[in-house]
Amino acid sequence: ATKLTEEKYELKEGQTLDVKCDYTLEKFASSQKAWQIIRDGEMPKTLACTERPSKNSHPVQVGRIILEDYHDHGLLRVRMVNLQVEDSGLYQCVIYQPPKEPHMLFDRIRLVVTKGFSGTPGSNENSTQNVYKIPPTTTKALCPLYTSPRTVTQAPPKSTADVSTPDSEINLTNVTDIIRVPVFN
């Protein structure tokens, strides 16, 4: 079995998580990609996905999550802005490749958000001034429906699939509470 590795990000409320997931560009450049959260004992849940086919660099925003897919560099950039303590958890980037199950991109991201004043949002460990001129808007894209025959009793392995419904959408005040991923990096 492939050993799953995690990269830990410790950030404060209000800051921005800014991570990059790289992929084999020749193989997956225009494939649809997604950002998922993994909870113990559950299947990964899709929080946001790129369009299909994925558009080069064009941002897709779902609430506080922004995806940007840079085809020429084989890179999916994921940003979660204005982080909240409840956003803490384990995340992963995946590539949708129907009819097969999603392909996970390493490494998984262990996000730890703590309370504490952060003058202005930054990313990674760094606090940097930014200016938000207008509230984030939501672009919509359709995330495909995946089901898996397996029952998951622990943090799922690489090949586990997402079970979000196509018309689902995120609770914009708490990205870890998935209610329904919108039709819309």
Partner: antibody, heavy 117, light 107 residues
Framework: EVQLVESGGGLVQPGGSLRLSCAAS????????MSWVRQAPGKGLEWVAN????????YYVDSVKGRFTISRDNAKNSLYLQMNSLRAEDTAVYYC??????????WGQGTLVTVSS | DIQMTQSPSSVSASVGDRVTITCRAS??????LAWYQQKPGRAPKLLIY???RLQSGVPSRFSGSGSGTDFTLTISSLRPEDFATYYC?????????FGQGTKVEIK
Amino acid sequence: EVQLVESGGGLVQPGGSLRLSCAASGFTFSSYWMSWVRQAPGKGLEWVANIKQDGSEEYYVDSVKGRFTISRDNAKNSLYLQMNSLRAEDTAVYYCARDYGDAFDYWGQGTLVTVSS
Amino acid sequence: DIQMTQSPSSVSASVGDRVTITCRASQGIRKWLAWYQQKPGRAPKLLIYAASRLQSGVPSRFSGSGSGTDFTLTISSLRPEDFATYYCLQAHGFPWTFGQGTKVEIK
């Protein structure tokens, strides 16, 4: 072919203002973060500021915060840098660059800003 | 901010030589490092991104390696047009930061 062309540089006195422009062509300007990077004479490169695709977020290096403002006009495929309260240490060639996720992949030819009395 | 330290600051070499430039990050940046070439009076040109991926159109004599904190740019056989200043850029932690540059001069 991707092209970035800066303009607006020149000689200005300390405390003065200048507005730099960057005209972009050959790519979908509105889909990319854009940055200004500068290089003092005989020195290395320093990122100055960047702006999100729709202009809703701006970031600045500490040394220019409160003095410089980055903006863009996607309808005109143009990037701007408004520089106020200029100091001698702001003297540099200013480059407009396209952010490509993990690198600045295209750069303009640069425009020289000289702050001197 | 993440500091990037390049070495050496300058290197004298001859056409055909193998040249190696190193860049060290003050903290881990995974593979998010790019290399640039700059000639006098010109804008920087992207050579390598993601530590080892060659930018389109860049000759294969340029190669990059490394991850975490230590990275290397290698020019396998120096050509006359390669005499220039080379910079590394980390794109992991915001703000992105450059190394101070390495000048490759003619011996």
